[in-house]
Each structure stands twice: as structure tokens, then as C-alpha cells.
């Protein structure tokens, strides 16, 4: 299930005045598409161009991150007169052209979504042959990937003065809220660190001082679900053990 965000500002500004018989270069992409991790998403992209009945060689390209300079994630080429766009690049084999570039449609399907796919994507078409021309969406479509929480790391670490602290790192979108529970803790939100730069979906919570032996449980929760993991502290054994 894919939701396309309607940009109210765009709609407000989008009052058609006259229709124009001759097209010019333009690209239409929604501001945002949302889908869940593990699912597939469709990134719509249609275009108009000034070259009537163009039938020459063309290349369709999608890039990620930034316009013009971002890395390509998909590229295909269609020979003169052909409606088949032969895939030349599909990053990790997860990108597939849904649209027909000959019919001004570059829509792309992204399979097996991961949180790392949460980026802005830019479509581009290039004409070669009799006509040499190209156009790229400047604003792009933001792929918003949502995911239930997953605890990626839970550990007990030594602290100064023979003490111990516990760390719990989870990922999810929306970023999950983390809570620790354990001996003499009740439920504690315990020093949640903000998502780190470049790791926007990761959240870390620290228990700075473990005062009692026993089981400490980290719970990560967001609107899509929850996840738990535990560590065990046995100081009388002179060591700590972890179980997830």
C-alpha cells in the first residue's frame, strides 16, 4: 500500500488557465510517497517535452539524494522506435521501471524497501539521435519509509569505579521511544540520545549506572509496533551476560 502525499500548497497554486497546444519540458512528481519497510513503493514521474513524435534513442535515469549530482540508482535505454527500455543499472536489483518512457512515463517501482531508501529521488530523461536534449526533475519525490521498531544493539559496558552502564540502540520510523525497565527501575526513559547525524532512524538510550543485579529490558515503541530485548547483569560472578 502506497500513499501519495497531496501538497496543498502545490494544489493551491495549480490553477490551470489556458491549455497550450505545444508542450515544453516539464516533469510531474508528487512531493512525497510513503510505504513500509519490506514493502514496495511506486515513485511516479511523468513528463512533457517539446519534440513532437520523438522516436529516437532515449535513456531514463533515476538518481538519489540530490539532483544532477546524486548517484544513479536506475538507468535504462530504449533504441530508436522501441518501447522496450533495456535496464542497464538497477541498484541491488530492487529498482524496476513501471512506466513507458515512450509515453512520457518514467514511474519506478522500488522493491523490498529498507529505511536506508528513505531519500529524495530525481527522474531524468535524455534524448539522443536527431534530437539531443535532456530534462531532470529538480525537486524530486521524497520516499518516506516507515518501519516498526527493531532493537539493533543492546549491551552492558563497564564504567569507572567498577560500575556498569547499559546501552540500547533501536531503529524505526517514526523514530521509536525507548524505555528501560529492570530491578529498582520501574519504567524509565533513561537518557535517550537524539538520532545521530546521518543515522536519522537510530535512537540510543543509556542507563548510566546499574545498581542491582538482574534482568534489564529495553522496549522500543512507535506507531507501527514495539520491540523488546534484555540484558542480564550478574556482578557477583564478576561478569555481565547479555541475552537478546
Amino acid at each position: 500500500f502506497v500513499r501519495t502525499k497531496i501538497d496543498t500548497t502545490e494544489n493551491l497554486l495549480n490553477t490551470e488557465v489556458h491549455s497550450s497546444p505545444a508542450q515544453r519540458w516539464s516533469m510531474q512528481v508528487p512531493p512525497e510517497v510513503s510505504a513500509e519497510a519490506g514493502d514496495a513503493a511506486v515513485l511516479p514521474c511523468t513528463f512533457t517535452h517539446p519534440h513532437r513524435h520523438y522516436d529516437g534513442p532515449l535513456t531514463a535515469i533515476w538518481r538519489a539524494g540530490e539532483p544532477y549530482a546524486g548517484p544513479q540508482v536506475f538507468r535504462c535505454a530504449a533504441a530508436r522506435g522501441s518501447e522496450l527500455c533495456q535496464t542497464a543499472l538497477s541498484l541491488h536489483g530492487r529498482f524496476r521501471l513501471l512506466g513507458n518512457p515512450r509515453r512520457n512515463d518514467l514511474s519506478l517501482r522500488v522493491e523490498r524497501l529498507a529505511l536506508a531508501d528513505d531519500r529524495r529521488y530525481f527522474c531524468r530523461v535524455e534524448f539522443a539521435g536527431d534530437v539531443h536534449d535532456r530534462y531532470e526533475s529538480r525537486h524530486g519525490v521524497r520516499l518516506h519509509v516507515t518501519a516498526a521498531p527493531r532493537i539493533v544493539n543492546i549491551s552492558v559496558l563497564p564504567s569507572p569505579a567498577h560500575a556498569f552502564r547499559a546501552l540500547c540502540t533501536a531503529e524505526g520510523e517514526p523514530p521509536p521511544a525507548l524505555a528501560w525497565s529492570g530491578p529498582a527501575l520501574g519504567n524509565s526513559l533513561a537518557a535517550v540520545r537524539s538520532p545521530r547525524e546521518g543515522h536519522g532512524h537510530l535512537v540510543t538510550a543509556e542507563l548510566p549506572a546499574l545498581t542491582h543485579d538482574g534482568r534489564y529490558t529495553c522496549t522500543a515503541a512507535n506507531s507501527l509496533g514495539r520491540s523488546e530485548a534484555s540484558v542480564y547483569l550478574f556482578r557477583f560472578h564478576g561478569a555481565s551476560g547479555a541475552s537478546t
Partner: antibody
Framework: QLQLQESGPGLVKPSETLSLTCAVS???????WSWVRQPPGKGLEWIGE???????TYKPSLKSRVTISVDNSKNQLSLKLTSVTAADTAVYYC???????????WGRGTMVTVSS | SSELTQDPAVSVALGQTVRITCRGD??????ASWYQQKPRQAPQLVIY???NRASGIPDRFSGSISGNTASLTITGAQAEDEAAYFC???????????FGGGTKVTVL
């Protein structure tokens, strides 16, 4: 609501560097942003643009003298124009590109005079 | 010289129709946008892309494009429409933006 505010020295000496900033408030800086100038009594001249990712494009005749950058943490963009002459005297505007090549939000502009 | 050419000035009687033109080879490939600028004010977007009105712009303003010419038409001009009007688009290479020289509209 989105507002843009240009700021910088109103007077710059010839051969020096003109430095302006544009503060973006009321919205994310995730977009394309342009600097446009207007000499007194004349038309608009596009200087260049920057995407929030740092990609830039400059007017070819100014390219050797101009640098446009964006500071996402401060929600501002900046313009640097080196080796200025009297011909660079103008009102300088920053503007947001909301659709391909169309600017829907403009700052009020700041007047910069190049004179010794 | 600008890659987009506009007539320096036009006048129109109150309530009448005026058409402002913008010419340039790049307009065969790219859409034009139009801006209104009143004295001591920043420009304001009027028409963009495939002849779409910007937010808050009255429907007496309309746009069209044909060949290498983009046009802005004010049907039933009002006193408050007296201003300079600028067009902008891409250059012929598509690599950067250009503005027309502007047209001063006087409402008589």
C-alpha cells in the same frame, strides 16, 4: 509562513568581496534557492542557485566571482561576490524556487552600493 | 543582451485588455514564469509553468505560450495592475535561468 530576510553590509569598496546572508524562517530549507539582483532603475538579473544538498548553478558571466552556499543547521544561505565594481551596485534578493524555474517567495531585498 | 526580450513599456486604458510578450529561443523548449513588481517592492509571482496562476492572483491574469513567445494577458486592467512585469525561463542550453528586461505597464 515562510519568510526570507537578506542581510549584509550596505556599502562595499571596489575590488573587495560582497557577502550577504538570507535567513529562512517558517519552513524547511529543503529546496532550491536563488539569488537575484536588480541594479537601480533596471531589470532583474539571476545570479545563481543552490539546492539544500549543496548543488549549485551559477550564471556563466558571474561564475568566476560568485559562491552560493547553504547552511542547513542555521537555515540560511549565503552569497559571496568577489572583486566587486560599481556595476555590482544593486538590490540583492534571495528567492525560493517552488516549481521548476518559478520563484514564489522573495525576500524584501537589501541594497548594496559599491563605492570607495 | 538578454536571452529573453520584452517591450520596455505598454499602456492600457482602465478596464481594457493588455498583452505583454516575452520572446526567446529557449521558450520553444521551456515554460516561462511571470512576475509583477511595484516600486520599492520585491517581485511577486503571477503565472508559472503551463500557465498556472500563483496563489492569490486574480483570474484577470492569464498566460499562454506559442512558438518562441510567451504572453501575459491582463483582461480588464485595474489601477493596481500598474507595475513592471518580468518573465523568466531557462536559457537555451537549459543550464541556467534568465529574466527578460521587463515591461512597464501603465494603466490610463
Amino acid at each position: 509562513q515562510l519568510q526570507l530576510q537578506e542581510s549584509g553590509p550596505g556599502l562595499v569598496k571596489p575590488s573587495e568581496t560582497l557577502s550577504l546572508t538570507c535567513a529562512v524562517s517558517g519552513a524547511s530549507i529543503s529546496n532550491w534557492w536563488s539569488w537575484v539582483r536588480q541594479p537601480p532603475g533596471k531589470g532583474l538579473e539571476w545570479i545563481g542557485e543552490v539546492h539544500h544538498s549543496g548543488v549549485t548553478t551559477y550564471k556563466p558571466s558571474l561564475k568566476s566571482r560568485v559562491t552560493i552556499s547553504v547552511d542547513n543547521s542555521k537555515n540560511q544561505l549565503s552569497l559571496k561576490l568577489t572583486s566587486v565594481t560599481a556595476a555590482d551596485t544593486a538590490v540583492y534578493y534571495c528567492a525560493r524556487e517552488f516549481a521548476d524555474d518559478a520563484f514564489d517567495i522573495w525576500g524584501r531585498g537589501t541594497m548594496v552600493t559599491v563605492s570607495s | 543582451s538578454s536571452e529573453l526580450t520584452q517591450d520596455p513599456a505598454v499602456s492600457v486604458a482602465l478596464g481594457q485588455t493588455v498583452r505583454i510578450t516575452c520572446r526567446g529561443d529557449s521558450l520553444r523548449k521551456y515554460y516561462a514564469s511571470w512576475y509583477q513588481q511595484k516600486p520599492r517592492q520585491a517581485p511577486q509571482l503571477v503565472i508559472y509553468h503551463k500557465n498556472n496562476r500563483a496563489s492569490g492572483i486574480p483570474d484577470r491574469f492569464s498566460g499562454s505560450i506559442s512558438g518562441n513567445t510567451a504572453s501575459l494577458t491582463i483582461t480588464g486592467a485595474q489601477a493596481e495592475d500598474e507595475a513592471a512585469y518580468f518573465c523568466n525561463s531557462r536559457d537555451t542550453s537549459g543550464n541556467y535561468l534568465v529574466f527578460g528586461g521587463g515591461t512597464k505597464v501603465t494603466v490610463l
